[in-house]
């Protein structure tokens, strides 16, 4: 069995699960949280948490909004110590071996361990490791930045491109552009799609004489990445007199395969590496983050990693009552599972973080998008929330109808910086920007009625389309500043929330067996396509298809 | 803590073999790149063989063809073995790791090879 850490196979075993039950059906569906705040002039006190950073700026957590009270949030901590999430958090903070069906690690955690305390997997100590692969990206990013790295003409390197996918490519991407403020030595551009337009928009834009390929596959096999690193060093070659000897001035590699690397052209000096026990997700701490330190510099790197650093002592230090992450997990499984809800919105209401839902759905959905415990069984409840999300206030203006009005309950977090890096016409753009954060956190809440919409004039067959029920949950985040501190520690805050749901649901939140499948069969459909002859291997459907393409392509 | 145990040397005569162990433990092996280096008596140490963490192999000019170097991950161990000894190749050995990512490197205590009649 790979049920060595938990010593129950579902949740609904857990006598705390049927109580949340019984609570649900007779308080939870029914509570108003508009009169929750009438009975309890401390709601707000009670229920909002303040982290503070390593640096001593701070992120509000506003909890508040969401429909539990005392007796909830109390039963679901009791669902969390049955569950036994806080030994399961352990272990993983201990290097033991919690992707059970991989027999991995899962030590993303030890890579943003700044403090340089033993952190052991099998028996090692990975922390000289891993400041050691620090040390290197330091040396090789401020070489590069500084313009004492030339390219083969001997100018300087302007513009740096990371070809990766999935956790080599979101990541990074997401990163580079919530820190944008912080750059301006280099450009960044990142080629993920498979899609020939991908690589060749990007190549239109860069000089073959001061660009820098990284190319971001551990194992330095991923179909897309390798195909789109082919391309872009074909060109580079028919760019540059065809010398191949040019290539370690302009390419590094992002990974442990040092005899691919090789053969590819690059120099294994180049060739920054990570361990196992580092998941694709949850490698933007690792050396998938060079492009990061290349655009925003090392010393800013570094603070990102102290953030989620700080998140991390948190969390492994924090009672259970005042423990952020684990709250914010607990209410996803209480919306997920008792009310029903599929779906977890995130809204920055902030431009620099417009790539950040993307980067959650990922981590979120690839981690708890499972429907088999680690006892082997399937579930009999809801797992996995769809993630979604875009900017306010833009958001504001397309699904926000439906969070505010439609169906379905649809649990929110918005996100909002007080202070902008941008506080232009005498900040009258963050002002207004933060007028909105608040309000549709309080129109969620609160809501109006069909008395307060005959009030305002309206009258007949118009008043229910003006009506807002409200009651819908919202958890609003402020932080003071988006620095990389700030940014490392949100992250940080999402996978252990993340990691909270999936110890409650007792899956497997580190493996991506559902990536596997589409993979093979695209290999063999790949064959196919090399050929004029008509398929008739598939089902009717599949062969209907390639067989249209083969005739238009 | 990390070990880098060397094994293997002793006395043997000219034309001889004998085969070096280092046992490797406070590692990450699989990412090293592993190497053997000597130092004989009032001389500098010069490096022997090298073996990357894929498995490509470099030596020395005075050793190629009669040295072999390999690596065991699974057992964290890298060998030499050493064949058509002769007098010059008497010196203290040393087992030696290098990080494959970053600047971190490690040193065993070295095992003595004398070649003599």
């Known amino acids: 069995s790979n049920n060595s850490f938990t010593n129950f196979k579902l949740a609904t075993e857990l006598p705390a699960w049927s109580k949340l039950q019984k609570i649900y059906e007779s308080q939870g569906k029914t509570l108003s949280v508009k009169q929750e705040f009438q009975k309890d002039a401390k709601r707000f006190e009670k229920l909002n948490k303040t982290f503070t950073n390593y640096d001593g700026s701070k992120i509000l957590f506003d909890y508040s909004k969401n429909l539990v009270n005392d007796e909830i949030i109390a039963a679901l901590i009791e669902l969390a110590k049955e569950a036994n999430v806080t030994g399961l958090r352990d272990a993983m903070f201990k290097g033991e071996h919690i992707n059970s069906t991989e027999d991995r690690a899962v030590y993303h955690v030890a890579l943003r361990n700044r403090a340089n305390k033993p952190m052991y997997v099998d028996g090692v100590n990975v922390a000289p490791e891993v400041d050691s692969v620090l040390k290197h990206m330091k040396e090789f990013s401020e070489q590069v930045r500084s313009g004492e790295w030339k390219g083969y003409t001997g100018k300087k390197i302007t513009d740096v491109v990371n070809i990766g996918i999935g956790g080599s490519d979101l990541g990074p991407v997401m990163v580079t552009e919530a820190l944008k403020h912080y750059a301006g030595v280099l450009d960044v551009h990142f080629v993920s799609n498979i899609d020939g337009t991908h690589i060749a928009e990007t190549l239109k834009v860069v000089d073959p004489e001061t660009t820098l390929f990284l190319i971001a596959s551990k194992t330095f096999t991923t179909a897309e990445t390798i195909t789109n690193a082919n391309t872009a060093k074909n060109w580079f070659l028919s760019k540059t007199g065809n010398d191949p000897s040019h290539i370690a001035k302009h390419f590094a590699a992002l990974s442990t395969n040092e005899t691919e690397v090789a053969k590819f052209g690059i120099d294994t000096k180049n060739m920054f590496g990570f361990e196992s026990w580092v998941g694709g997700r949850y490698s933007v701490w690792s050396a998938i983050g060079l492009s990061v330190a290349l655009y925003i510099g090392y010393d800013n790197f570094e603070a990102f990693l102290k953030g989620a650093e700080a998140v991390d002592n948190h969390f492994t230090q924090t009672p259970l009552e005042d423990n952020i992450p684990l709250l914010g997990g607990l209410l996803s499984v209480w919306y997920n599972n008792f009310f029903g809800a599929q779906t977890h919105l995130v809204a920055p209401f902030d431009q620099y973080l417009h790539r950040f839902p993307a980067y959650l759905q990922q981590l979120s959905m690839e981690s708890n998008g499972k429907s088999v415990t680690r006892g082997n069984v399937f579930t009999d409840y809801s797992t996995g929330s769809i993630l979604f999300g875009e900017p306010a206030t833009n958001a504001q203006h397309s699904f926000f109808q439906l969070v505010h009005q439609g169906t379905k309950l649809i649990p929110s977090d918005f996100i909002l910086a007080a202070q902008s890096h941008n506080p232009i016409e005498n900040k009258l753009h963050q002002k207004m920007l933060a007028s909105n954060f608040f309000a549709q956190a309080e129109a969620l809440m609160v809501g109006k009625d069909e008395e307060q919409v005959k009030a305002e004039g309206a009258t007949g067959g118009l008043v229910p389309h003006k009506v807002f029920s409200g009651n819908r949950p919202t958890t609003s985040i402020l932080a003071q500043k988006i620095t990389p501190a700030t940014l490392g520690a949100l992250i940080a805050y999402y996978e252990h929330v993340t990691f909270t749901e999936g110890a409650i649901w007792n899956i497997n939140s580190f493996d991506q067996w559902g990536v596997e499948l589409g993979k093979v069969l695209a290999k063999v459909i790949g064959k196919e396509l090399d050929n004029s002859s008509t398929i008739s291997t598939h089902d009717a459907s599949t062969n209907g298809l390639i067989n249209q393409f083969k005739e238009w392509m | 803590q990390v070990q880098l145990v060397e094994s293997g040397g002793g006395l043997v005569q000219p034309g001889g073999s004998l085969r070096l162990s280092c046992a490797a433990s406070?590692?990450?092996?699989?990412?090293?790149?592993m190497g053997w280096y000597r130092q004989a008596p009032g001389k500098q140490r010069e490096l022997v063989s090298t073996?990357?963490?894929?498995?490509?192999?470099d030596y020395a000019v005075s050793v190629k063809g009669r040295f072999t170097i390999s690596r065991d991950n699974a057992k964290n161990t890298v060998y030499l073995q050493m064949n058509n000894l002769n007098s010059e190749d008497t010196a203290v050995y040393y087992c030696?790791?290098?990080?494959?990512?970053?600047?971190?490197?490690?040193w065993g205590q070295g095992t003595q090879v004398t070649v003599s009649s």
């Open positions: 030696h790791s290098q990080y494959a990512y970053g600047p971190l490197e490690y």
């Open positions: 406070g590692i990450s092996f699989h990412s090293y790149a």
């Open positions: 073996i990357t963490t894929g498995g490509s192999t």
